[in-house]
Interface confidence: medium
């Protein structure tokens, strides 16, 4: 005769308030004859949850028909779960006896715990922008989850990061927990289009982690490089000087031209282009009248980027005698 086994496959069952919980229990033998009862707890204070033969259990229903002759499934459903329902549930086989049934064998128990999903992770970056090669910190927070076990990972453009610190609070027993993690990220010059991702995995999410993202474009400042050049060709009595402001981010930029230290107010032509990496290039053209110029003209292109200290590049204008002659000729 096969020895009776009481099989409760789930060690832990996470349930949500208001939902229905299914507690599984199957037996491997129909013998000995006698009922299967459900209890919460095993000690003297254990509580009867379901007895097919007697009692009133309005929130409990059976998964299969217990009146069927060969039934071996004694699983139950408990509806409208509340926090008071947490505990370990045991299905227990009793052997028919006189004057009363005798407890024969218990299942290993299924612990019912309240599960709560973590909130969508919120990722916050630094308050101020930082230049490449420097380290910035990002924080990720998620709240309201239970049980306490949770996994958090950081990614930058799909590559997992390792430099981070994570805390789950509180450390003791609680109805719900919060996680906070701070990751340190070294900025690269091409990070304008980069993203950091905080990924949270929890048993309540059934293998589908939650993600929070932050764009490094909010955290990075790529300072421009400046180049001032004089175009070899002149247009009539004017020489074209170009100031090229390359590879900067964000777009916020002020450019001014100075001629021998005097700021020029007149309009200049300019173009803004966006690079593949998300940085910008700005080109400004400045036309200098050379008809009445001396040899010592110094042009300065000054750029103030994103509220930082101004940077400038100077160019001593080369006006050849030939050009001067040409311009003299051109003067009526």
């Amino acid at each position: 005769e096969e020895e009776l086994q009481m099989i409760q496959p789930e060690k832990l069952l996470l349930v949500t308030v208001g939902k229905t919980a299914t507690l599984h229990c199957t037996v491997t033998s129909l013998l000995p004859v006698g009922p299967v009862l459900w209890f919460r707890g095993v000690g003297p204070g254990r509580e009867l949850i379901y007895n097919q033969k007697e009692g009133h259990f309005p929130r409990v229903t059976t998964v299969s028909d217990l009146t069927k002759r060969n039934n071996m499934d004694f699983s139950i459903r408990i509806s409208s779960i509340t926090p008071a329902d947490v505990g370990t549930y045991y299905c227990v086989k009793f052997r028919k006896g006189s004057p009363e049934n005798v407890e024969f064998k218990s299942g290993p128990g299924t612990e019912m715990a309240l599960g709560a999903k973590p909130s969508a992770p919120v990722v916050l970056g630094p308050a101020a922008r930082t230049t490449p090669e420097h380290t910035v910190s990002f924080t990720c927070e998620s709240h309201g989850f239970s049980p306490r076990d949770i996994t958090l990972k950081w990614f930058k453009n799909g590559n997992e990061l390792s430099d981070f610190q994570t805390n789950v609070d509180p450390t003791g027993q609680s109805v719900a927990y919060s996680i906070r993690s701070t990751a340190r990220v070294v900025l690269d010059p091409w990070d304008v289009r980069s993203q950091v991702i905080c990924e949270v995995a929890h048993v309540t999410l059934q293998g589908d982690p939650l993600r929070g993202t932050a764009n490094l474009s909010e955290a990075i400042r790529v300072p421009p490089t400046l180049e001032v050049t004089q175009q070899p060709m002149r247009v009539g009595n004017q020489v074209n000087v170009t100031c090229q402001v390359r590879k900067f981010y964000p777009q916020s930029l002020q450019l001014t031209w100075s001629e021998n230290g005097n700021v020029c107010q007149r309009e200049t032509a300019s173009t803004l282009t966006e690079n593949k990496d998300g940085t910008y290039n700005w080109t400004s053209w400045f036309l200098v009248n050379i008809s009445d110029q001396r040899d010592d003209v110094v042009l300065t292109c000054q750029v103030k980027h994103d509220g930082q200290l101004a940077v400038s590049k100077r160019l001593a204008l080369e006006v050849t005698v030939h050009q001067k002659d040409q311009s003299s000729d051109a003067t009526p």
């Epitope: 919460r40 086989k93 006896g97 064998k105 218990s106």
Partner: antibody
Framework: QSVEESGGRLVTPGTPLTLACTVS????????ISWVRQAPEKGLEYIGI?????GASYASWAKGRFTISKTSTTVDLKITSPTPEDTATYFC?????????????WGPGTLVTVSL | AQVLTQTPASVSAAVGGTVTISCQSS????????LSWYQQKPGKPPKLLIY???TLASGVPSRFKGSGSGTQFTLTISDLESDDAATYFC??????????FGGGTEVVVK
């Protein structure tokens, strides 16, 4: 009517150890057996409880560290991976004929020493 | 986790005197009365004195009295005898199927 523990000895850390609680002189429809330990010069520490049907539950600190099981003649306590902090006298205690969580029959205890 | 706080940790009284030990639970015990008291002497296992908060165990003299309900319990030993010198523990039973002990109170009889 008595319970008696056995199996206590000197073990090295990490070596699993199983203690047995033998019940004699009882013919009961329902009873519960609890394992309790007492470190030298310290108080009583509840480990867990098992009923006649073999259903067991544990103190939260003891989950995973101990396993209580029932055979036809004994109730066993397995210390899965002992550490020096598990050095104590281990008692099994029986509750019968009452439904108040009290343990009215205690064994003399068995000493477990965990040391290198 | 449920915690039972016993006070005082040690108490001394003369033969014929009275000793009162308090046991406070961090949450209500099951059915408000799942509270037991034990006496333990050195080298011996604990002995049940009172169960159900106030019921005297078999063979225990009526000098021992248990009272209280819910979270607050008291053991009173009157007409103290030298044989009462021991450590006394309270034990609670909870709905979550946990049966922890208090920290113990040493009773010294002068």
């Amino acid at each position: 009517q008595s319970v008696e523990e056995s199996g206590g000895r000197l073990v090295t850390p990490g070596t699993p150890l199983t203690l047995a609680c033998t019940v004699s002189g009882f013919s009961l429809i329902s009873y519960y057996i609890s394992w309790v330990r007492q470190a030298p010069e310290k108080g009583l520490e509840y480990i867990g409880i098992i009923n006649i049907g073999g259903g067991a539950s544990y103190a939260s600190w003891a989950k995973g560290r101990f396993t209580i099981s029932k055979t036809s003649t004994t109730v066993d306590l397995k210390i899965t991976s002992p550490t020096p902090e598990d050095t104590a006298t281990y008692f099994c205690a029986m509750s019968y004929g009452m439904d108040t969580g009290a343990f009215n029959i205690w064994g003399p205890g068995t000493l477990v020493t965990v040391s290198l | 986790a449920q915690v039972l706080t016993q006070t005082p940790a040690s108490v001394s009284a003369a033969v014929g005197g009275t000793v009162t030990i308090s046991c406070q639970s961090s949450e209500s015990v099951y059915k408000n009365n799942f509270l037991s008291w034990y006496q333990q002497k050195p080298g011996k296992p604990p002995k049940l004195l009172i169960y159900g908060a106030s019921t005297l165990a078999s063979g225990v003299p009526s000098r021992f009295k248990g009272s209280g309900s819910g979270t607050q319990f008291t053991l009173t030993i009157s007409d103290l005898e030298s044989d009462d010198a021991a450590t006394y523990f309270c034990q609670g039973g909870y709905r979550t199927d946990i049966y922890p002990f208090g920290g113990g109170t040493e009773v010294v009889v002068k």
